[in-house]
Interface confidence: low
């Protein structure tokens, strides 16, 4: 049993042109979230199929709404870790699909919508209790960089998780052929339970249950001796109580490695020795060599030591991945400070300061008012990195330069109309109002609300508001 | 700071062993594989040895394999190749690597190397 652990990265338009456009929007905010679907093996098999090894969702990122006129960055991704329990053995070679689901915030009748934003897959081998394993993949215009890795759950170690771990029964070691459980060494390693009534000393297993036979017995619990009536056997007759054993095929007969390679045995298996140029189990995988210069943007090739890593690449600084393919994501740092945007131009970095900052890093905070005239007598704010201007009666807009209607506003009160006077403005209220506003009414006797009206004015004249 | 500094190179005569030292500073190597790559006059690098400390994995070029070992105390951060039945064709700059591993696919394991020391010189010779 174990946990196999997915870790996005980013998730972002691709390298190259057609930048994708953002899937969200000021009207339509949204959020990411990712689905995982294992299958064991190197499956062909549809992206329907049963997700046999496990599947997870994951949560759902923050809230997006993209910036007008900005390109459409990485979006913000989910917090954590999609994790797929296994319950049986990691099986080594696995498919994967990981989907990546946008959901939509609008207003939706029935709750959010979503929708498949990309979806990418993948055939690997991986061991569990390995490092973590980085990849990147593309869908479309989109770039998803990920991490993954299979952990074995206590007490299963080993590379398929298969092998056991228990509390030591002495303190000082382990019992006889049992090793330590690196990295836990208070802890042994539990005999495999092999399939019942297995002979210990004919038979041994490498996965619980099984029961398979040393050279010379045969039988389901390897009990058998392999013996003829006739002693042809190179090897020689044997004791007559085991007649003569004869070979079964040897594990190099027919000869197993591919592509010109030389097979030798070893106590349980084979070993192929590959020729140049090729790799594998078999020497069944052309790979690529040092000869073939893999290591892009001045990465240094070194020949893999492992019968199964072709080379290494020595990347320079800036760049990273298998094949120093991958330039370091500097701008992740957030080096741009006070909002500035961060562009990473390869031989540089450059940030996009916002209105009202500056510098390399847009560390200054500009004086927003410097050299900045409100027209008409109005006065400059400063605040939040942006200047406003506080504007005189009549005026406005950025830099007061406007006239501004005084009637835009409807101040004249029940009915009355306004009219546009240089110094202000004036209503001109309908029958039985007054007032500057003509928010008074006129008593039915004649007197009104107010004082007596100013001399030369009579009750439902033009009132001028100064 | 990734830091890597290597240490216990020497004049050894054929046939003699010596105990090389990586000692990592600025990361834990137990999130890594650490080798050893070695570079011989006149000849291109060549990656002697590998091991990842957080479950003992290693692997060895098939040059040292059965004289040189590779072992690791995450304890002191510290990754370490004791080369026995040392001969002349051993002679090269020892480097010190961070690996990092990216995986298994198209019939290989990927890695990188992206940090590495500035070297301990060995000598064999009689």
């Known amino acids: 049993a174990g946990v196999f652990e997915l870790q996005i990265h980013s998730f972002g338009p691709g390298p190259g042109p057609g930048a994708p456009r953002s899937p969200c929007s000021a009207r339509l905010p949204c959020r990411l979230f990712f689905r995982v679907c294992l299958k064991p093996g190197l499956s062909e098999e549809a992206a329907e199929s049963p997700c046999a090894l496990g599947a997870a969702l994951s949560a759902r990122g923050p809230v997006y709404t993209e910036q007008p006129g900005a390109p459409a960055p990485d979006l913000p991704l989910p917090d954590g870790l999609l994790q797929v329990p296994f319950r049986d053995a990691w099986p080594g070679t696995f498919s994967f699909i990981i989907e990546t689901w946008r959901e939509e915030l609008g207003d939706q009748i029935g709750g959010p919508a979503w929708s498949l934003l990309a979806r990418v897959a993948g055939r690997r081998r991986l061991a569990a209790g390995g490092p973590w394993a980085r990849d990147i993949q593309r869908a479309g215009a989109w770039e998803l960089r990920f991490s993954y890795r299979a952990r074995c759950e206590p007490p299963a170690v080993g590379t398929a998780c298969t092998r056991l771990c228990r509390p030591r029964s002495a303190p000082s070691r382990c019992g006889p052929g049992l090793r330590p459980c690196a990295p836990l060494e208070d802890e042994c390693e539990a005999p495999l339970v092999c399939r019942a009534g297995c002979s210990p000393e004919h038979g041994f297993c490498e996965q619980p249950g099984e029961c398979r036979c040393l050279e010379g017995w045969t039988g389901p619990l390897c009990t058998v001796p392999v013996s003829t009536s006739s002693c042809l056997s190179p090897r020689g007759p044997s004791s007559a109580t085991t007649g003569c054993l004869v070979p079964g095929p040897g594990p190099c007969d027919g000869n197993p490695c591919a592509n010109g390679g030389s097979c030798s045995e070893t106590p349980r298996s084979f070993e192929c020795t590959c020729p140049r140029g090729f790799y594998g189990l078999r020497c069944e995988v052309s790979g690529v060599t040092c000869a073939d210069g893999p290591c892009f943007n001045g990465g240094l090739c070194v020949g893999g030591a492992d019968p199964d890593s072709a080379y290494i690449c020595h990347c320079p600084p800036g760049f990273q991945g298998s094949n120093c393919e991958k330039r370091v994501d500097r701008c992740s740092l957030q080096p741009c400070r006070n909002g500035g945007l961060c562009l990473d131009l390869g031989h540089a970095l450059r940030c996009r300061c916002r209105a009202g900052f500056a510098g390399p890093r847009c560390e200054h905070d500009l004086d927003d008012c410097a050299g900045r005239a409100c027209a008409n007598g109005g006065t400059c704010v400063e605040g939040g990195g942006a200047h406003r201007c506080s504007c005189a009666l009549g005026f406005g807009g950025r830099d007061c330069r406007e006239r501004a209607d005084p009637c835009a506003a409807r101040p004249c009160a029940h009915g009355g109309r306004c009219y546009a006077h240089f110094s202000g403005l004036v209503c001109a209220c309908a029958p039985g109002y007054m007032g500057a506003r003509c928010e008074f009414p006129v008593h039915p006797d004649g007197a009104s609300a107010l004082p007596a009206a100013p001399p030369g004015l009579r009750p439902g004249d033009p009132q001028r508001y100064l | 700071e990734v830091q890597l500094v290597e240490s216990g190179g020497g004049l050894v005569q054929p046939g003699g062993s010596l105990r090389l030292s990586c000692a990592a500073s600025?990361?834990?190597?137990?999130?890594?594989?650490i080798g050893w790559v070695r570079r011989a006059p006149g000849k291109g690098e060549e990656l002697v040895a590998r091991i990842y400390p957080t479950n003992g994995y290693t692997r060895y070029a098939d040059s040292v394999k059965g004289r040189f070992t590779i072992s690791a105390d995450t304890s002191k951060n510290t990754a370490y190749l004791q080369m026995n039945s040392l001969r002349a064709e051993d002679t090269a700059v020892y480097y010190c690597a961070r690996h990092h591993y990216y995986g298994y696919h198209s019939g290989y394991h990927h890695y990188a190397i992206d940090y590495s020391g500035q070297g301990t010189l060995v000598t064999v010779s009689s």
């Open positions: 600025g990361f834990n190597i137990e999130h890594y594989s």
